[in-house]
Amino acid sequence: EEELQVIQPDKSVLVAAGETATLRCTATSLIPVGPIQWFRGAGPGRELIYNQKEGHFPRVTTVSDLTKRNNMDFSIRIGNITPADAGTYYCVKFRKGSPDDVEFKSGAGTELSVRAKPS
């Protein structure tokens, strides 16, 4: 079996303030089992945007039904975008762990740019 890759096909996305941003991410394998998380930024200071396993993320919805059998689409939509949302977003696959899941592989990132609303 080929090792899982995390594909973020869009290097950059431009969204108008107030609109919804779609950040695309797919995995190439069902193995290993484990959740996806989305972060803005990289390194220890990165900001968690969405965690499939747990948490409440009112601005975020998933594009696909995560409970759909054999789902490998982990794209998200972020609503009501503001200039503060600009940055690079990473889709990160975690491997089921005991007691905690372990980061397995990250996508290359998608840079979100926000176009100001015309006044």
Epitope: L30, V33, G34, E54, G55, D65, T67, R69, N71, K96
Partner: antibody, heavy 119, light 110 residues
Framework: QVQLVQSGAEVKKPGASVKVSCKAS????????INWVRQAPGQGLEWIAM????????HYNQIFKDRATLTTDTSTSTAYMELRSLRSDDTAVYYC????????????WGRGTLVTVSS | DIVLTQSPDSLAVSLGERATINCRAS??????????IFWYQQKPGQPPKLLIY???NLDSGVPDRFSGSGSGTDFTLTISSLQAEDVAVYYC????????FGQGTKLEIK
């Protein structure tokens, strides 16, 4: 840490119904299937049914389709399995189990609920 | 429905020796390049524990003396060097269709 806490042991008369609960914690309840499996004393595992808490989609083992009903309460992250028209051969330990990979498998299990059917 | 048949029903193996349990499906459990077979271990008074998923992938925290192999209709769970704590009943499960379990194999120490 994923936990599935089941309700306590039950003793029922033939013809009665039983409703077993399974309270989930440590993860987003609506993102993962819940399975129900039973095990009669000294016997093997028998799959009953599964439910997707996000939309209440269910799949049943044909053997139980007419007697079992799965439900969930997303406000309390609790799954329920009701079995009607109980017979002595329904005496078993009933387990709930969570499917962490949408593979129709059982990654995390409750401790089980013993249901005894006796006149 | 897919029927899973395990063999043998019971098995006695010496400590440190290899234990092999087989699971045969009544039709193929393969789809889209994956084999939808899972292996569980159950010790007395405990719920089952997932060992292997998609035929050959070790679940988190499972010792690497356990391994799974096979494709199509024939699958094997192998314990390379039996330890005392491996005494249990082992079940295969398929999910190519809706889940079904094999009848179980009881593993004891010789």
């Amino acid at each position: 840490q994923v936990q599935l806490v089941q309700s306590g042991a039950e003793v029922k008369k033939p013809g009665a119904s039983v409703k077993v609960s399974c309270k989930a914690s440590g993860y987003t309840f609506t993102n993962y299937w819940i399975n129900w499996v039973r095990q009669a004393p000294g016997q093997g595992l028998e799959w009953i049914a599964m439910i997707d808490p996000s939309d209440s989609e269910t799949h049943y083992n044909q053997i139980f389709k007419d007697r079992a009903t799965l439900t969930t309460d997303t406000s309390t992250s609790t799954a329920y399995m009701e079995l009607r028209s109980l017979r002595s051969d329904d005496t078993a330990v009933y387990y709930c189990a969570m499917d962490y990979g949408s593979l129709y498998a059982m990654d995390y299990w409750g401790r089980g609920t013993l249901v005894t059917v006796s006149s | 429905d897919i029927v899973l048949t395990q063999s043998p029903d019971s098995l006695a193996v010496s400590l440190g020796e290899r234990a092999t349990i087989n699971c045969r499906a009544s039709k193929s459990v393969s789809s889209s390049g994956y084999n939808y077979i899972f292996w569980y271990q159950q010790k007395p008074g405990q719920p089952p524990k997932l060992l292997i998923y998609l035929a050959s992938n070790l679940d988190s925290g499972v010792p690497d003396r356990f391994s799974g192999s096979g494709s199509g209709t024939d699958f094997t769970l192998t314990i390379s060097s039996l330890q005392a704590e491996d005494v249990a009943v082992y079940y295969c499960q398929e999910s190519r269709e809706l889940p079904t379990f094999g009848q179980g194999t009881k593993l004891e120490i010789k």
